[in-house]
């Protein structure tokens, strides 16, 4: 096994707001990550960088620094929030996300996350990519892995 294992668990919550004038959607997406330290000593998680893509366009980025210290043979669950904006050339989504005649306004987003840890004289980076459903029509709290989008063309990593 890797000395450090990173597992993207899923979307924990998505909080939505709109700007009707600009036909813009603001989504604050909180994701959950499990980081396991298989070393015999504590390891520093130096940073987590994340970005969210919609339709191959980056709609949000986030970076967390000096996250945590993980003890030997231990695991920590970390939540991180990526503020996203769906606007401009994607403002057509405003109509879909605010449509009252449908209950669930799921869109497919690609979550990318890179975890950087200090390990044996160098910084080790571990990346994960996952497609997830997010409801852009209301504030939603998800059961972990509930929002997973299974796409045979994009198998889980």
């Amino acid at each position: 096994p890797r000395s450090i294992e990173v597992k993207y668990i899923g979307v924990k919550s998505a909080y939505v707001s709109y700007d009707a004038e600009k036909r813009t959607i603001y989504l604050n997406i909180t994701n959950t990550l499990n980081i396991t330290n298989n070393n015999y000593y504590s390891v520093e998680v130096e940073n987590i960088t994340a970005q969210v893509q919609f339709s191959k366009t980056v709609i949000g980025k986030a970076r967390l620094n000096n996250i945590t210290n993980i003890g030997p043979l231990d695991m920590k669950q970390i939540d991180y929030t990526v503020p996203t904006v769906i606007a401009e050339e994607m403002s057509y989504m405003y109509d879909f996300c605010t449509l009252l005649s449908i209950k669930v306004h799921n869109i497919v987003l690609m979550m990318q996350v890179t975890v950087t840890t200090a390990y044996f004289g160098h910084s080790e980076q571990i990346s994960q990519e996952r497609y997830q459903y997010v409801d852009c029509g209301r504030n939603t709290t998800y059961q972990l892995a509930q929002s997973e989008y299974l796409n045979v063309l994009q198998p889980q990593q």
Epitope: T36, Y40, Y41, S42, G71, P72, L73, M75, F120
Partner: antibody, heavy 120, light 112 residues
Framework: QVQLQQSGAELIRPGTSVKVSCKAS????????IEWVKKRPGQGLEWIGV????????NYNEKFKGKATLTADKSSSTAYMQLSSLTSEDSAVYFC?????????????WGQGTTVTVSS | DIVVTQTPLSLPVSFGDQVSISCRSS???????????LSWYLHKPGQSPQLLIY???NRFSGVPDRFSGSGSGTDFTLKISTIKPEDLGMYYC?????????FGGGTKLEIK
Amino acid sequence: QVQLQQSGAELIRPGTSVKVSCKASGYAFTNYLIEWVKKRPGQGLEWIGVINPGSGITNYNEKFKGKATLTADKSSSTAYMQLSSLTSEDSAVYFCARSDFITTVVADYWGQGTTVTVSS
Amino acid sequence: DIVVTQTPLSLPVSFGDQVSISCRSSQSLTNYYGNTYLSWYLHKPGQSPQLLIYGISNRFSGVPDRFSGSGSGTDFTLKISTIKPEDLGMYYCLQGTHQPRTFGGGTKLEIK
């Protein structure tokens, strides 16, 4: 004071399994790792594996994967090692020891050892 | 796996002698944070192994100062300055940095 009290000697038939216990006292059980070590007559010490009792995460010597299973019960501050499909090669004294998370102290306190004899 | 080579296999001594035991690892035992997990143990027949030295050179509580450890990276030494009867037994080094932990083959300290 720190103590690791191991279960008593076992005489086991080949092909069966045995579970050795290691009860910790005198310190915070989940703040230390528990190591397991094998000693056969005329041979050196052999490291089997280690468990973090807080997380339940284990790491094994490749040689003992499938042979030893390490678990821990936080409520009773007891670590366990189950040995399966026993053969005469598994006849040995098995020790548990604790290791500090924070410092470089590995296996500072040891149990008294449990003798496992595999014989028909 | 890290190979830990201990020499000599056997060490015949007289009481009062000073002796050295060597332990060499196939890879550096110093991790990213500068810690080196190298320990020394004495195992006497019918007893549990006892920790003598941890982190290369730190004497464990209650261990007499005639025991000392030194070294860095891949080469380590245990010195016993004045051998006493209670020092006889098997000495082992253990590397605790890399997965899996590995013991040296042992050095038997015995009377000439």
